[in-house]
C-alpha cells in the first residue's frame, strides 16, 4: 500500500514537474511574443506617423504644384491668344515673370555681382530693373523685400546711367541720404559704381562684385518673347 | 543668449558620409544667413559654405563643391551640412557661424566645433 | 578668389604693448572686412566688422583702419587675454576667404 502511494507521488511530482516546466516555456514563448508585438506595434506607430508626415507634405507640394500650374496656365493662355491675335501689343509675361504696368519683372532668388547679373538679365532679352516711379519702386520694394537687390544703374563709365538709356538727371530718384557716395577708398580703381536698393528700399551704390539680389525687367510688347 | 551647438562629428572612412547639425537659439534664426568654416589640426580657418536666411542662396568653397551640401530647417531652428565622399583632408573642426545679414555680410556669432577625423 | 596676407605671422609682445596686424587683399575689398581672435581650443570670437566697426561687448583697445587692399588691426595696450590668434577676412565676395593668421606671444 506505502509503495503504491509512493508511486503515485512520484507521478504527480513528475507531472507537475512537466506542467511546471510547460507553463514555464508558454510564459516564456508569450513574453518574446509580446515584445516582439510590442516592437513591431511601435514600428507601426513609427510608420504610420512617417506616413502621415510624408503626405502631409506631399499635400503641401502638391496645393504648391497646383498652384504653379494655375498661375502658368494663365500665362500660357495669355501668350496663345498673343500668337493667334494679329500682332497687337501683347498683355502678358512669360512664365515665372510677374507683369506691372507695361512691363514684366523676374526677381532672382541667389546673388551675383552686378555683372552677372546684368548679363543673365540680358540672355532673358531683358535688363537690369530700370526704376521711373514711386509707384513702380513700391511694387519692385514689395517683390525684393528687406535684401539689397541690383538695379540698372550704374556709373562704371563716368557719369550715373540707366542700362536702357532712360535720362538719369530728370528721372526718378530715391538714393538714401548722403547717396551716392561713389566712395573711392575700396581701391577697385573706381569708386562704388553700382546701385542697389537697401533693405528699405532706399537706393545706394556699392561695389560691384557684391553678390545680391538683382531684378530684371523687360517690356509687355510682342518682341520679348516668352 | 544668443548660442550655436554643432553636433554630428565624428571619426569616418574615406569616401564614406556624414552630416553635421548646428542647433541655433537666442535669436530669429530665419532672418540670418548662416554658414560653416572649418579649421584643420594647425591650420587656420577656411571658409566652407553659405546658406542664404531663407535657403535660396548657397555657395560653397572650390575644395568641397560637389561633395558637401549645406541646408537649413528654418521652423526647428537647425542648419545642416551633409558631406559626403570625405577625404583626409577633411579632417577639421567644424564651426557653425551666424552671418550678420542675410548671408553676404560678416560673421558675429560661432558655435563651439564639432570634430570631424577621415581617416582609415 | 580673393587671397589674404597677414602679417607677421606670430608676434612677442610684453603686457602694455601696442600691437598692430596688418591684412593685405590681393584685390581692393572696399571695407568688407572683418577681424577675429581665436585662444587654444576655442572657437573664433568676432571682434571688428566693416575694417572698423566694434563688434558688442568687445573691448576699444582694438581697433581696425583701411580701406581697400590694405588693413590694420591694433590692440592699444596688451593684456594677458590678449595673447590669441588674430585673423581677417573678407567679405566682399564668395568665397570668403581668412588671412594665415597671426599668433601673438608673450615676451
Known amino acids: 500500500q506505502n509503495s503504491k502511494l509512493q508511486e503515485e507521488l512520484q507521478a504527480l511530482r513528475e507531472t507537475f514537474s512537466n506542467l511546471t516546466a510547460s507553463t514555464d516555456a508558454k510564459v516564456k514563448t508569450l513574453s518574446m511574443q509580446g515584445g516582439n508585438v510590442g516592437r513591431k506595434m511601435k514600428s507601426l506607430e513609427s510608420q504610420l506617423e512617417k506616413q502621415q508626415q510624408d503626405l502631409s507634405e506631399d499635400h503641401s507640394s502638391l496645393l504648391l504644384h497646383v498652384k504653379q500650374f494655375v498661375s502658368d496656365l494663365r500665362s500660357l493662355s495669355c501668350q496663345m491668344a498673343v500668337l493667334q491675335g494679329n500682332g497687337s501689343e501683347r498683355t502678358c509675361c512669360p512664365v515665372n515673370w510677374v507683369g506691372y504696368e507695361g512691363s514684366c519683372y523676374w526677381f532672382s532668388r541667389s546673388g551675383k555681382p552686378w555683372p552677372e547679373a546684368e548679363k543673365y538679365c540680358q540672355l532673358e532679352n531683358a535688363h537690369l530693373v530700370v526704376v521711373g516711379s514711386w509707384e513702380e519702386q513700391k511694387f519692385i520694394q514689395h517683390h525684393v523685400g528687406p535684401v539689397n537687390s541690383w538695379i540698372g544703374l550704374t556709373d562704371q563709365s563716368g557719369p550715373w546711367k540707366w542700362v536702357d538709356g532712360t535720362d538719369y538727371e530728370s528721372g526718378f530718384k530715391n538714393w538714401r541720404p548722403e547717396q551716392p557716395d561713389d566712395w573711392y577708398g575700396h581701391g577697385l580703381g573706381g569708386g562704388e559704381d553700382c546701385a542697389h536698393f537697401t533693405e528699405d528700399g532706399g537706393w545706394n551704390d556699392d561695389i560691384c562684385q557684391r553678390p545680391y539680389r538683382w531684378v530684371c525687367e523687360t517690356q509687355r510688347d510682342r518682341d520679348s518673347g516668352s | 543668449q544668443v548660442q550655436l551647438v554643432e553636433s554630428g562629428g565624428g571619426v569616418v572612412q574615406p569616401g564614406r558620409s556624414l552630416k553635421l547639425s548646428c542647433a541655433a537659439s537666442g535669436f530669429t534664426f530665419s532672418t540670418y544667413g548662416m554658414h560653416w568654416v572649418r579649421q584643420a589640426p594647425g591650420k587656420g580657418l577656411e571658409w566652407v559654405a553659405v546658406i542664404w536666411y531663407d535657403g535660396t542662396n548657397k555657395n560653397y568653397a572650390d575644395s568641397v563643391k560637389g561633395r558637401f551640401t549645406i541646408s537649413r530647417d528654418n521652423s526647428k531652428n537647425t542648419l545642416c551640412l551633409q558631406m559626403n565622399s570625405l577625404r583626409a583632408e577633411d579632417t577639421a573642426v567644424y564651426y557653425c557661424?551666424?552671418?550678420?545679414?542675410?548671408?553676404?555680410?560678416?560673421?558675429?556669432?560661432w558655435g563651439q566645433g564639432t570634430t570631424v577625423t577621415v581617416s582609415s | 578668389d580673393i587671397q589674404m596676407a597677414q602679417s607677421p605671422s606670430s608676434l612677442s609682445a610684453s603686457v602694455g604693448d601696442r600691437v598692430t596686424i596688418t591684412c593685405r587683399t590681393s584685390?581692393?575689398?572696399?571695407?568688407?572686412l572683418a577681424w577675429f581672435q581665436q585662444k587654444p581650443g576655442k572657437a573664433p570670437k568676432s571682434l571688428l566688422y566693416k575694417a572698423s566697426s566694434l563688434q558688442g561687448g568687445v573691448p576699444s583697445k582694438f581697433s581696425g583702419s583701411g580701406s581697400g587692399t590694405d588693413f590694420t588691426l591694433t590692440i592699444s595696450s596688451l593684456q594677458p587675454e590678449d595673447f590669441a590668434t588674430y585673423y581677417c577676412q573678407q567679405y566682399m565676395t564668395y568665397p570668403l576667404t581668412f588671412g594665415g593668421g597671426t599668433k601673438v606671444e608673450i615676451k
Open positions: 557661424a551666424r552671418d550678420q545679414g542675410v548671408g553676404y555680410d560678416g560673421l558675429d556669432v
Open positions: 584685390q581692393g575689398i572696399g571695407k568688407y
